[in-house]
Amino acid sequence: HTAAQDNCTCPTNKMTVCSPDGPGGRCQCRALGSGMAVDCSTLTSKCLLLKARMSAPKNARTLVRPSEHALVDNDGLYDPDCDPEGRFKARQCNQTSVCWCVNSVGVRRTDKGDLSLRCDELVRTHHILIDLRHRPTAGAFNHSDLDAELRRLFRERYRLHPKFVAAVHYEQPTIQIELRQNTSQKAAGDVDIGDAAYYFERDIKGESLFQGRGGLDLRVRGEPLQVERTLIYYLDEIPPKFSMKRLT
């Protein structure tokens, strides 16, 4: 038992198994559920995290969908198929051969069909709106302080470049964080906005994915920011394709 084995952990994903059996005795961590090797210097993809989560399943959750093009994760948890890079495969199917197409954050963007359903490409979610309501405080937060603190959080905790935090809106008690990242803007090594939003969502729920860290302690000028509810809306580069029946 060496110091190397003590150090062989995954700071950014506690849903892993790590051992110093990589090339040259280096630490290597594999995601639970998929067994895929993960890069522990950055966020693990949402697809691999969902797959790991499904190896210890919890109850599904339901959110609200407010507009025709904004998608919300209404289908809750499922055991996804991930590609070799850990991204969602465009077509997802369940054990009963019901299939559907998803976007890059794994949210269904078509009606459900059978095994003949075709999903030609993985459509990128390029705009995410995180809608938060905070618990009552003595007074409203200063908008610029709140903006700076949330940008700092996304950079320092979720490794997301500040340029991808498009805006922070605030009308007490509602906070909206807009994340934008087009395919052309995302360079190799950049954290995906979908992954950052998922880590944030889990943090807000008190289900941190980080190894051995305390939960999220959000403060604005020393004042705790406690979130009562969260809704996340996903906008895709190509609008979703649902039948009219679903829209009525």
Epitope: T2, C10, P11, T16, C18, R26, C27, A37, H161, P162
Partner: antibody
């Protein structure tokens, strides 16, 4: 805990070389970043590239270093820097340094090697 | 992104105080380190997180600031403080730009 660089010396223009950084008293299998930083004679410090030595081997490169410099870590005890198409402007002392955190965007260097001098001249 | 360090050189007597400033072109929160380098030696970490003293560094060294403006203050100057001082951040490393300031040479008279 110590770091030591090797592989420096005199190189001809357009030549290449490989620098190695070895650690003693600790293992390169932790959850931190190892960096190469250089300093031209009488000039300031500039980073070349870091590599994550935990699971994943992520790297970043300074804009000017992309394509000519390659950082790698093939074992739990060494990090290497390969440089190609060298010019006189690459003459410098090359340091390896250990980042103190696993977050590359919040890194500072708490352990440095003594440096190895690379001179590019015909 | 750029780190601008001023002045490039400063001279003060033993027992005096030196103030070095570092300005980031973008907000880097408190993610700034200060280093001391003497000729022929590698840099030595003095301060990290803008204001936290590294292990073994005397309390005469003080770091302050956040966001874009940072200061290193050395009080009760000693001859051993003669060195070049650098500020550094890795906050925007993914932009491929140098996170080191240009350096400040401190001469102790």
């Amino acid at each position: 805990q110590q770091l030591e660089e090797s592989g420096g010396g005199l190189v001809k223009p357009e030549g290449s070389l490989t620098l190695t950084c070895k650690g003693s008293g600790f293992d390169f299998s932790g959850t931190y970043w190892m960096w190469w930083v250089r300093q031209a004679p009488g000039k300031g410090l500039e980073w070349i590239a870091p590599i994550y030595v935990g699971s994943g081997s992520s790297t970043y490169y300074a804009s000017w270093a992309k394509g000519r410099f390659t950082i790698s870590s093939t074992s739990s005890t060494a990090v290497t820097l390969q440089a190609t198409s060298l010019t006189a402007a690459d003459t410098a002392t090359y340091f390896c340094a250990r980042g103190a955190t696993n977050n590359v965007f919040m890194n500072y260097f708490n352990l440095w090697g003594p440096g190895t001098l690379v001179t590019v001249s015909s | 992104f750029e780190m601008t360090q001023t002045p490039s050189s400063v001279s003060e007597p033993v027992g005096g105080t030196v103030t070095i400033k570092c300005q980031a072109s973008e907000d880097i929160s408190s993610n700034l380190g200060w280093y001391q380098q003497k000729p022929g030696q590698p840099p030595k970490l003095l301060i990290y997180g803008a204001s936290t003293l590294a292990s073994g560094v005397p309390s005469r060294f003080k770091g302050s600031g956040s966001g874009t403006e940072f200061t290193l203050t050395i009080s009760d100057l000693e001859p051993a403080d003669a060195a070049t001082y650098y500020c550094q951040t890795s906050y925007y490393i993914d932009d491929g730009v140098n996170g080191f300031g240009g350096g400040t040479e401190v001469v102790v008279k």
